[in-house]
Each structure stands twice: as C-alpha cells, then as structure tokens.
C-alpha cells in the first residue's frame, strides 16, 4: 500500500539503484516515485554531512522485501516512494530554494525582477528543467537579477551549492502550467531525426508518448510499429531531443509513428501510467511472481498491488490454466518497459497502475460565513482541492468554499446550507482559480446528497461540518485533486505552516473576490482563543487561527473552505472555515471546525453502499 511517513535521522543501507542531487527530501521522494525500480530513498541535507560531494545527495533504493535496514545518521531523511499513492503522485514541484545554487548546463541568461519571473521563464522554455536567480543583494553586482535557465542529462542538478542571495527552483511544466502549448498530433508513417536520449520497447505509440512526456530530456519520439520491416527494431520507441527543441528533419517511413512530448501542454497532462490491456500480446521481463487468477483485469490488479511489479502477461494457454483461473506472470525490468514484446500469442498483457493518480474511489486520510482579509492571489493548481459552492436561483452566486476529499466527496461547513437545504439549487465548481472564468458552458458538479452533522443546530457554532456527495465522480488532475485528512484525534502534530483560502470578502463590508485568495495564518491555542471569545464556548472540536494584531483572516464567502497545514511535505485539512467576530479584527481569531475530531463521522458517512470504507490511507 501507500506509505507516506518520513524517517528523520535515518538512512537506508544498501539497495542503491540510482543517485542524484536534489534540493530537499520531497523532491528526492518524487524522483523515487517516478523511477521504475525505486521503492525507498534516503536524502542527505547540507547540514547532515561534511563531505561536500554528498551534500544534497538523494539515494534511490530498491528491495526485494520492500524494506531495508535503517542506520542512524543525524540530519538524514528517508522514506518511501509514493507509488500506489493515487492523487499524491505528481511530478510538479513548486518550491523555491533560498540560499541554494542548483548547477547544470547554463544555456540562457537574462535579467528579471523576481525569482517568480525567472521560474516563469524556465516554465516557458522548452529545454529548461531548473533555474537559479541571483537576488538584488548578490555579492557580485554584475550578476544581480540574473536568471539562469539550466538543464542536465538526468533532469536534476549536477551539483547543489549553498550560496547566499541565490534562489533556485524547477520548471513548472510538470504542473501543466507551461505557456508553450503542445502538439497533440501523432504522425503516421513519419520518422523524426536528431539525438536519441533513450530507447524502450512499447506496445503502441501512445505508451511511447507518455514515456517521452515523463522523461526529463525527451522532446519528441519515433515509434517503430509491430509490422516494421526490421524485426529486431519492432516496437522500439526512440525518445529524442534537439538543440532547437523541435525535429530538424522528418522522413516519410512506412510503419513508423512520430509525435511530441506532452509536457508543455497547458492545464492537462497525461497520467504517468498506462491502463490499456493488449490482447494477443506477451510482455517479456524479469519474473517477479506467477499467480493463478480469474481474468486479465484481476491480473492487472494483482500487478498493481505488488509494488515492484511493472507489467504483466496473463496466459490463456491450456497448460497455464486450471478451472477458470490462468497464470498471471508479474514482471519487471531495469527501465520499467518490457524487454520483449511478442504478438499473436495466447496471452494478454498490460502495465501496473501503481503510478495512476486517479487512485480508487476514496477519500484520503493519513495515519501519521466567512473571505480572506489581508491575503494574496493564488496561482493555478496551488490549492487543487478548493471548490466553490454556488447557488443558482434567479441569478447564480458564490456562497461558500469547500474541500474535495475524494472523487465524489466534498467537505464543507454545515451553516452553508442554513435556509438552502435543497440539493438541486447548488452547483459545485472545482479546478478553477477565477470566478469570472465561469460561464454557462463551464462544467460543474451537482449534489447527490447533503449530509449535515446530526448535532449541528442553526445559529450555533458547534459541529459546523457537512459532507456533500456528488452525483458523479470527478477525475483528478493537477488542478483538481483531494486534500488529505488528518488522522483521528490528531493532537500531537505541531503545525507551523497553515493557510486559509477562499473567494470571500476582502474586508468586513466587502464583496466576493474574483481570484482565489490565500493567507498564511498561525494556529492559536484553544486556551488563548477562549480568552478572546468569552461569550462563546470554544470546544476541543474547534481550532482557532489568527494574528494577535489582526489584519489577516477568513471572511464572508470563505465559510466551508479549507484551513490546510503542510507537515513533512504533505498538506492536510486541519480545519473548516466556520465563524469569527467580524473579520481580521485585533485579538479576534477565526474559528474553524477541527477535522481530526470528526474523522469517525467522516469515515462512517463516506462508506460506500456495499459497506466498504471509501477511505484510502497513504500511510
């Protein structure tokens, strides 16, 4: 299953499959997730080691048993790949690293006014993988405001150095934020020239294209079909690049198919997995296991659940079958692709779905009336769980926020439905940033069921929590995916990085905002909060957040929206925007429903009709 816990001061011994330099443990974990054989990783921050060569070292590891011995190493961070972790699988990495220079091939230098602009330039350049920016206080005046666009053979820095007044980061192309745009077309009977960066075997051109999209240096590809004239080159997928970023020439060639990486697509990237099953095809590779199962779909599920399995073949040969079950060959290879593809066989083959980010039809947990005042504009995909709950009577308007917690579930505040309990009047918009982008053609979700907490009473602040079951499940994308829930009764975690988001009022007597706003707000102890609200009872099932001096808060229109906190690189839904005295007033923190206290209720209500809990635990 999915394991998200990180091990501080621990290093996994042995099992190395690759090593690289990464700026932090989260990026190292992402590289492990996308590496075909990596199950575990260990990361050495600069502070953990004197050896300059090993600073920022990210070590990717494999293990037949799924685990390795841990040795104590001060400062080291270790953890698991996020394969099988559904919506948490993403190649998108937004963080900016201050005081760090990520080295690589510098192919472009320009003057810009901010690190954000530098990141944008990198995202809009087809060859840029990462960048470094010298701030206005950099020690050498001639380098100040320099934005260096970079690439490397592996897509990660060739070295990382601690350097004052330098900020570094990665291209946001994997976040589907590139302005370049992409070529969706596939060209039959056409072969591209230029430099081959890798060669893999694939059953069709579309798997070839997805592999190209997620390969750090692939910009376009040529696929030689199963009927290509040279037998030894059949099903070969050549991943290619060029200096210009486009093919310098193409040749008409029967039984070849060419196309482009989709990494520069805006708003939508292909999933990093291949769900199609190929009848009459055998995939060769290293044998991991052989099991008898009923049907090719069960074989694929078995492969997906066995974390080291990369692909499979389900044999229908009489000698491989007994009763209704046949042999399911679970296989793997060094690069994650079959080492041999044979056609016209009595098997059906396919790939593990361990990297599919749709996951199952579940809500995400972890084991381990009120808008934003004093906030700033959010950017695309920054808060992909945020939804807008709108009511359409004669006109349509935004009333509340909410949080996507599963394919078919939204968590919000019960008071949003005061006087409006009819599910037909509600429209739920997900994957949006600007309310003004909503037109009559914008897709929205309708409500199947509103589940208000049984102990909630109108005009009282207690148990202000409600679940919405959507009529149809939503697909996950970089802009629309769920937030993980805390573990039940989560009291031990100290959250220091918490944010509230919403389209609500920007001042007490204001109006709904167009762009989703965000504000960083510290949590306040319940004792402190109770002192500020002596006329109200602040219960253990509430959490408070705000600045003593005020100025930043949720406000009208943010109700039901998320209070999220980042811990160990993972966002969790800590609170639901509920109530407060005015907005952003001095010594009047915002009050939020404490989600951890309602985990039993959420689990009970989100159980599917067949009684199977729709909670997925990544830990």
């Amino acid at each position: 299953g999915c394991l998200t816990q990180l091990y501080e001061n621990a290093f996994f011994r042995g099992g190395d499959v690759a090593s690289m330099y990464t700026p932090n443990a989260q990026y190292c974990q992402m590289r492990c997730t996308f590496h075909p054989r990596c199950l575990l990783f260990s990361f050495l921050p600069a502070s953990s080691i004197n050896d300059m060569e090993k600073r920022f070292g990210c070590f990717l590891k494999d293990s037949v048993t799924g685990t390795l011995p841990k040795v104590h190493r001060t400062g080291a961070v270790s953890g698991h790949s996020l394969k099988q972790c559904g919506h948490q699988i993403s190649a998108c990495h937004r963080d900016i690293y201050k005081g760090v220079d990520m080295r690589g091939v510098n192919f472009n230098v320009s003057k810009v006014s901010s690190v954000e602009e530098c990141q944008k330039r990198c995202t809009s350049n087809i060859r840029c993988q990462f960048f470094s920016y010298a701030t206005q206080t950099f020690h050498k005046a001639e380098y100040r405001n320099n934005c260096l666009l970079k690439y490397s053979p592996g897509g990660t820095p060739t070295a990382i150095k601690v350097l004052s007044n330098v900020e570094s980061g990665f291209s946001l192309k994997p976040c589907a934020l590139s302005e370049i745009g992409c070529h969706m077309n596939i060209f039959q009977h056409l072969a591209f020239s230029d430099v081959d960066v890798a060669r893999v075997l694939t059953p069709d051109a579309f798997v070839c294209r997805t592999i190209c999209t997620y390969h750090p240096n692939c910009l376009f590809f040529t696929f030689y079909t199963n009927v290509w004239k040279i037998e030894s080159q059949r099903n070969v997928c050549l991943l290619k690049t060029s200096e210009s970023g486009t093919p310098s020439s193409s040749t008409p060639q029967e039984n070849t198919i060419s196309g482009y990486s989709l990494l520069t697509c805006k708003r939508t990237l292909p999933e990093p997995c291949h769900s199609k099953i190929y009848p009459g095809v055998d995939f060769g590779g290293e044998e991991l296991n052989v099991t008898f199962v009923k049907g090719v779909n069960v074989c694929q599920e078995t492969c997906t659940k066995m974390i080291r399995c990369q692909f499979f073949t389900y044999s229908l040969l009489p000698e491989d079958c007994k009763e209704e079950k046949c042999k399911c060959f679970l296989r793997l290879s060094m690069d994650g692709s079959p080492t041999r593809i044979a056609y016209g066989t009595q098997g059906s083959s396919g790939y593990s779905l361990r990297l599919c980010n749709t996951g199952d039809n579940s809500v995400c947990t972890t084991k381990t009336s009120t808008r934003i005042v004093g906030g700033t504009n959010s950017s695309w995909g920054e808060w992909p769980w945020q939804v807008s709950l709108q009511v359409k009577l004669t006109a349509q308007r935004h009333l509340c926020g909410g949080s996507l917690i599963g394919h078919q579930w939204v968590l919000t505040a019960a008071h949003c439905f005061d006087g409006l309990p009819l599910q037909d009047v509600w429209r739920i918009y997900s994957g949006i940033l600007n309310l003004s982008d909503i037109t009559k053609d914008t897709p929205f979700s309708q409500i199947k069921e509103i589940i208000i907490h049984q102990n909630y009473k109108v005009s009282e602040g207690n148990h202000d929590i409600a679940l919405i079951k959507l009529q149809a499940p939503l697909n996950y994308t970089e802009f629309q995916k769920p937030i993980c829930l805390p573990s039940k009764g989560d009291t031990s975690t100290i959250y220091t990085n918490c944010w509230v988001t919403g389209w609500g009022f920007s001042k007490e007597k204001g109006e709904i905002q167009n762009i989703l706003q965000k504000v960083n707000i510290p949590l306040v102890t319940n004792e402190e909060c109770q002192k500020r609200y002596q006329d109200y009872k602040i219960t253990q099932r509430m959490v408070c957040a705000g600045y003593k001096e005020g100025g930043k808060d949720a406000c009208k229109g943010d109700s039901g929206g998320p209070l999220v906190c980042k811990h160990n690189g993972m966002w969790r839904l800590v609170g639901i925007t509920s109530w407060g005295e005015g907005c952003a007033r001095r010594e009047q923190p915002g009050v939020y429903t404490k989600v951890a206290e309602y985990m039993d209720w959420i689990l009970e209500k989100t159980q599917s009709s067949d009684g199977k809990a729709q909670m997925q635990s990544p830990a």
Epitope: A205, N226, V227, P279, Y343, T345, T358
Partner: antibody, heavy 119, light 107 residues
C-alpha cells in the same frame, strides 16, 4: 494499396450455417490482427469477432459466442467467419476489417457482404 | 463491457456550418477513442484515431478532442460530402465497442 474483399454472404434459414471469407491484399496479412464487424439494416456498427495475427487468440461478442468461429489462413491471406445456428437477429452486412495495433484503430474496412437469415 | 453514448443521435445542418458531436464512455478509456464516417451504403472510414489524430488523407476540417470519458468530434465548414453517419469507438478494453452513431443530414 490495401484491399479487403468479403464473400460468402446470402440468404439462409434460421438454424442454418454460412461461411464468410475475406481476401486481403496490399499488406503483410500475417502481421495484422483482423476482425469482423456487422451492421443490421438501419442500425449501428457492432463488433463481432477478432483474431490475433498468428490466429492463436480469438475473441467473440457475447451475442455470437459458441455459434460463430473466426479463423485465418495466413498462407492464403484470407480471414474466415464460420456462422452456425443462425438467427434472424444475425441479419446484417458483415465487414471484414484490419486492426492497426500501433495506432489502436480499425484503419481499413472491406465493402461488406450481406447475410440475411429468414424463413 | 464499456458503453459508448453518443449525442445527438441526429442533427440537421447546412453547408458551411460547424458541427459538434460528443461521445461519452462509461469508464475512462484514456485517449483510446476513434471516429468513423459512414456514408449511405458504404463501408465505414477512419477519420480520427486516438481522440485527436487525423487519419492520413482526411480533410483538416475534421478535428477531435477529449480524454478520459468525454470526447468531441468537430466538423468545421461542413461540406456536401460530410452528410453521413458518424460513429465513435473505444479501443481501450476488449470488446471494442461502438457508439450508436450520429446522423448528420441536410437542413
């Protein structure tokens, strides 16, 4: 030029049998998966049966399973559909088609042969 | 089996019009969706493969889009020879199922 030419259709009584043939030319027949697709009068397209390039793997729609048999002779570049226990609802134009695995599409179709099942 | 739902089942349009036909799969089929054109009394012809790719020889006024469960075929500047029935078909999971078809006729 790729060509697929069906033959063997005609009028048959319910419960009767018929064998359709499809002669292929203009491509290496033994390297492609092939299939039969039918279309009842005034209705839509319905996949009937598929066969792998070597003939080892065969697939059937539930509506014809146990009654129809798909086969091929790669030495003769010919695809067959043996239809037994025919029913009135099997009345349709039967198309022979080539499956292009690499692009995951049916890229060439024959002109079709009409099978009428009636007493 | 994966069900394919097409809409509308028929439509009337004039030469020069822009026509849009939608196809919805009962479960995700990634990008494995094809569009075929069938003129009266003729065999079907492949127009678009893998959701958005124009088959060789097909005029560029035909275009396709979509992924997952929802797909669209668009015909820009409708020509007299485009009056026909259009079928979507998924090639993701056996059996390869077709949509019921959309008949485009002259207004």
């Amino acid at each position: 030029e790729v060509q697929l030419l069906e033959s063997g259709g005609g009028l048959v009584q319910p419960g009767g049998s018929l064998r359709l043939s499809c002669a292929a030319s203009g491509f290496t027949f033994s390297e492609y998966d092939m299939m039969w697709v039918r279309q009842a009068p005034g209705k839509g397209l319905e996949w009937v049966s598929s066969i792998g390039s070597s003939g080892g793997m065969t697939y059937y729609a539930d509506s014809v399973k146990g009654r129809f048999t798909i086969s091929r002779d790669n030495s003769k570049n010919t695809l067959y559909l043996q239809m037994n226990s025919l029913r009135a609802e099997d009345t349709a134009v039967y198309y022979c088609a080539r499956d292009q695995v690499a692009a995951a599409a049916i890229d060439y179709w024959g002109q079709g042969t009409l099978v009428t099942v009636s007493s | 089996d994966i069900q394919m739902i097409q809409s509308p089942s028929s439509l009337s349009a004039s030469v020069g019009d822009r026509v849009t036909i939608t196809c919805r799969a009962s479960q995700s089929i990634s990008g494995y969706l094809n569009w075929y054109q069938q003129r009266s009394g003729k065999a079907p012809k492949l127009l678009i493969f893998a959701a958005s790719n124009l088959q060789t020889g097909v005029p560029s006024r035909f275009s396709g889009s979509g992924s997952g469960t929802d797909f669209t075929l668009t015909i820009n500047n409708l020509q007299p020879e485009d009056f026909a029935t259009y079928y979507c078909q998924q090639s993701h999971t056996p059996p390869k199922t077709f949509g019921p078809g959309t008949k485009v006729d002259i207004k």
